[in-house]
């Protein structure tokens, strides 16, 4: 008689993450960033959809807003006036592009517990926000800017001359949401609430994409966007200022633009409020490597705002574009003069710096071969920041404090040392003051939202620990992640590598190459994440790979500015090297090699797989870009400036994909594309397609009809399936 | 109409125990924090603690720790308020408050209940 | 635990005039802009019933001529013109720090 047979237990649970796993979400984690309403005040959403305000000096909890009040109106957001008289409840929302959003809004009183009757808000609205003190309320309706003093007051209007896709007031066109503001509004409340500042944005004479949109009907729609690509006619804007005190006296007045930057086509970049009476606009010239940051005073005998050219502060690259990948924004001080502000110093590394009369003066504050990623909040006597100085790691993300009442200021890591195997990708969310604030740790560890003190910094409590997933986890396979680096030609390469659970040196495993590589971005990041590729490691047994090369952030100047003005070379160049030095590694199989992307990497794996190496078998291009002629002007010039023959049209026309047809001839390419992609048009693959047709080259394709850029909703599913199976097709893989 | 109808007077003995009860209407009672308030007679009013009846988290006054306890029966919509160790400096009325918590006021309370204790 | 003092004592205000309670607090009660301080009205043998909270802002139901102000440690209630209704018990509250505490509270009656 044998004995039975002993099983690992632990093992023999175990199981490897399965697609369906992907595709359903199973093992995403939740974050826990307060709705800060005071210096001890949050409010959050609770599990049962209550709104919940949560005192941190009390440990108390109150149902500000319960369920049944939102479930009346259908609503899926709220805001808070900042008297707390009344809140905002948003619903029948309706996406537009990628912030941008359209709603209907309801008012709800808190002191009687009614929703507001009479002069109603129109619907739908474009964008709505209280004033920082009491309850305002500014909206856009039409592209049109509206005020009320009291919610439940008839309206009073500001603009009048807005015009779908024409003239916008309050909220930015396509381009200056997507490239420049990074948000759906482009007003801005003064700190008291005397003010209201907004741009206008002047599309008459841009030219309009058109695509058809098919949906359920007999004739499919046309979308008509004003989307200036390269080269073409940009929008142009104004900044206007208006008392909303007493908005009929003068009505809104202009923000002058700085003589240097009015002599050309230019761009507005941002706007910061100082005080109720000084404002700072920056300005971006169209060629992206001069931005002027201007600090404007309002005017009481005339009623206008001036700005002096004294208040002009100059930021020049000479070696790329102004900034990162937008032109930072500054903090001010408390004497609302001086600000901090992140721009690089004299080595090439982006670093705060402290200015108090010109630039030329600057104080550098933090310095080192690492990045000042992010400046939190200045307190009177402490400056927190974002940084990945610690232990050299590009990737990660820890907070800092900088004591600047003091002096010499003295540097503390806040996070460091706090879970450090978990956690060490930051960020941040401080209380009025800095009196609290929340850590949000993503990673490499499970991610864990947690409470502190903002003067001793001694964690409180634990917001969110996703204990649920790490439960849902213990009886998978998760592959093993490392994160090192190549050092190739005095160039340091980035990579981080997913491999198989029961990863073995001596054996040989298929590569998959995920890259984005686009200007600024970073992919090689401490963060944890179950996502598709972890699947292909766990279950398929793939090894994937993610190479940050030139162009990317967050490692100084010289790897950052390396592709200016020659997009499309030294990425696709930098994921060729890594391949190779992933091949003398010794456990890639040589022959089994794909390389994926998305939007930017979508075009930097098409380049790579027409780069004639014959190191790629196969690769996939999803939604990519095939030409910058193609691309919206804000992007694609900072990087590239203009697509004339004066300036950098040779590298416009030899850096698109359709340029290399002939080379996707040895390999295996699946091209994918959303019809109704706003952003990287679907004409991106209809002429990848075009040139392969023309060029007689065997190809895979899938369009995925009315979706955008994202690709979401079912599908996603259908994607992600699609790919895999071309992925296992090409790795010979069984089903 | 929000009512808050609270048990009637007691009178109890020095070291006894008392458990008031506050039933809540025209409202739904986990819409609102509950507090208690007493009132000595002739003398002003006394803050007793809160309840948040979702999860029956409550803060007390340091000063009727030990002596007061808050309790939520979400199915009865009544609050309760036991109180124990009982001396005649806790004759008083003890107020059941419905609480705003957005505004930190109380902004209705029930008719009160009076507790004598007298041997 | 925040004391406040609130004057006078008692009050004697004619028909129709306007009467004035003052409420100092031992320390600042204002909260990021707001101040969280309340104004209740008590009758013979009836609970308390809110009148202002948040300073300034007027609880349901609560006549016009009831208005409150105030800032830092200093708050008053205003009752104008004053009616015979009126006539009552009047208490301060802060609620910006636990424990929440009352004024002694001030009597007011017709002159």
């Known amino acids: 008689l044998r004995p039975p047979r002993v099983h690992n237990s632990e093992e023999n649970t175990m199981r490897a993450l399965t697609l369906k796993d992907i595709l359903n979400g199973t093992f995403s984690y939740k974050t826990f960033f307060p709705n800060w309403i005071s210096g001890q005040e949050y409010l959050h959403q609770s599990a049962d959809n209550n709104i919940v305000l949560y005192n941190i000096e009390t440990g108390q909890s109150y149902t500000i807003l319960s369920n049944r009040t939102m479930k009346s109106v259908n609503a899926s957001n709220y805001g808070l006036s900042p008297d707390r008289q009344f809140v905002y409840l948003e619903s029948d929302y309706s996406k537009l592009w990628r912030y941008s959003y359209t709603a209907t809004y309801y008012i709800y009183d808190l002191s009687n517990g009614e929703f507001v009757r009479g002069n109603e808000l129109p619907r739908p609205i474009q964008y709505l926000c209280w004033s920082p003190v009491g309850s305002k309320l500014a909206y856009v309706y039409q592209n049109n800017i509206y005020l009320k003093q009291r919610p439940g007051d008839p309206p009073f209007q500001i603009t009048f001359n807005g015009r779908e896709n024409k003239i916008f007031n309050g909220i930015p066109d396509w381009v200056y949401e997507e490239e420049m503001l990074a948000t759906k509004y482009a007003l801005w409340w003064s700190p008291n609430g005397k003010f209201l500042a907004y741009a206008e944005f002047n599309d008459t004479d841009i030219p309009v994409i058109a695509y058809s949109y098919y949906g359920d009907e007999q004739y499919p729609r046309t979308i008509n966007i004003p989307y200036p690509k390269a080269g073409a006619k940009n929008p142009f804007v104004r900044i206007f200022i208006i008392d909303t005190t007493y908005p009929a006296y003068v009505g809104p007045q202009e923000v002058p633009v700085p003589a240097m930057i009015a002599s050309s086509d230019y761009y507005f970049s941002w706007l910061t409020w100082v005080t109720d009476e000084r404002v700072c606009l920056q300005w971006l010239k169209r060629v992206q490597n001069v931005s002027v940051l201007s600090i404007c005073d309002f005017r009481e005998d005339w009623q206008t705002w001036d700005c002096p050219k004294t208040q002009e502060h100059i930021e020049e690259s000479r070696t790329g574009w102004a900034g990162g990948f937008f032109v930072s924004t500054p903090v001010f001080s408390y004497d609302a003069i001086s600000y901090y502000k992140i721009f690089s110093d004299k080595d090439g590394y982006k670093h705060i710096h402290y200015i108090k009369d010109t630039v030329e003066n600057a104080i550098q504050i933090t310095s080192g071969k690492w990045e000042a990623i992010n400046i939190f909040r200045v307190t009177q006597d402490s400056l927190f920041y974002s940084s990945n100085e610690f232990e050299d790691y590009p990737g990660r993300r820890n907070i800092y404090r900088i004591s600047i009442g003091s002096y010499p200021p003295s540097k503390k890591c806040v996070t460091c040392h706090l879970r450090k195997e978990r956690c060490q990708y930051y960020t941040a969310s401080f209380s009025d003051y800095a009196k609290y604030y929340a850590l949000v740790c993503y990673g490499p560890g499970i991610p864990i939202s947690t409470l502190h003190d903002g003067r001793t910094d001694q964690e409180i409590k634990i917001l969110e620990e996703n204990k649920e997933l790490e439960n849902a986890l213990k009886n998978i396979q998760l592959p093993k992640e490392e994160i090192k680096k190549l050092e190739v030609d005095e160039i340091t390469l980035w990579y981080k590598m997913i491999l198989p659970p029961q990863f073995d040196r001596s054996k040989k495993y298929p590569l998959l190459i995920q890259v984005y590589g686009g200007p600024c971005s970073q992919s090689v990041r401490s963060v944890f994440a179950v996502n598709w590729i972890s699947y292909l490691a766990s279950k398929e047994g793939m090894v994937i790979a993610l190479v940050d090369g030139r162009g990317t952030a967050f490692q100084g100047d010289k790897l950052l500015y390396a592709v200016y003005r020659k997009l499309g070379v030294y990425e696709v160049e930098d994921q060729i090297t890594a391949v190779r030095k992933f091949i003398e590694m010794g456990f890639i199989d040589e022959k089994r090699i794909a390389i994926w992307g998305w939007s930017y990497g979508g075009y930097v794996s098409s380049l790579a797989l027409a780069s004639g190496t014959g190191l790629f078998k196969c690769g996939i291009a999803v939604a990519p870009v095939s030409s910058w002629e193609y691309y919206a002007s804000v992007y694609t010039e900072r990087f590239m400036g203009l697509p004339t023959k004066d300036d950098n049209l040779e590298h416009y026309k030899n850096s698109t994909v359709m340029a290399r047809a002939e080379y996707f001839r040895n390999v295996d390419y699946l091209l994918i594309h959303g019809t109704a992609d706003d952003n990287v048009h679907f004409q991106n693959s209809a002429q990848i397609a075009k040139a392969l047709v023309n060029a007689q080259v065997d190809f895979q394709a899938m369009w995925y009809s009315d979706q955008n850029h994202g690709l979401s909703g079912l599908s996603t599913n259908h994607l992600y399936t699609h790919m895999t199976h071309f992925l296992k097709q090409c790795f010979s893989l069984s089903d | 109409e929000v009512l808050l109808q609270q048990s009637g007077p007691e009178l109890v003995k020095p070291g006894a125990s008392v458990k008031i009860a506050c039933k809540a209407s025209?409202?739904?009672?986990?819409?609102?924090?509950m507090d208690w308030v007493r009132q000595s007679h002739g003398k002003s009013l006394e803050w007793i603690g809160d309840?948040?009846?979702?999860?029956?988290?409550?803060i007390y006054n340091q000063k009727f720790k030990g002596k007061a306890t808050l309790t939520i029966d979400k199915s009865s919509s009544t609050a309760y308020m036991d109180l124990r160790s009982l001396t005649s400096e806790d004759t008083a009325v003890y107020y059941c408050?419905?609480?705003?918590?957005?505004?930190?006021?109380?902004?209705?309370w029930g008719q009160g209940t009076s507790v004598t204790v007298s041997s | 635990d925040i004391v406040l003092t609130q004057s006078p004592v008692s009050l004697a205000v004619s028909l129709g005039q306007r009467a004035t309670i003052s409420c100092r607090a031992s320390?600042?009660?204002?909260?990021?802009?707001?101040?969280?301080i309340n104004w209740f009205q008590q009758k013979p043998g009836q609970p308390p019933k809110l009148l202002i909270y948040?300073?300034?802002n007027r609880g349901s139901g609560v006549p016009a001529r009831f208005s409150g102000s105030g800032s830092g440690t200093d708050f008053s209630l205003n009752i104008h013109p004053m009616e015979e209704d009126d006539t009552a018990m009047y208490f301060c509250?802060?609620?910006?720090?636990?424990?929440?505490?009352f004024g002694g509270g001030t009597n007011l009656e017709i002159k």
């Open positions: 408050t419905r609480f705003r918590g957005i505004h930190y006021a109380m902004d209705y």
């Open positions: 025209g409202y739904t009672l986990t819409d609102y924090n």
């Open positions: 309840i948040y009846p979702n999860t029956g988290g409550t």
């Open positions: 320390e600042s009660v204002d909260n990021y802009g707001l101040s969280f």
């Open positions: 948040g300073t300034s």
């Open positions: 509250q802060q609620s910006n720090e636990v424990p929440y505490t």
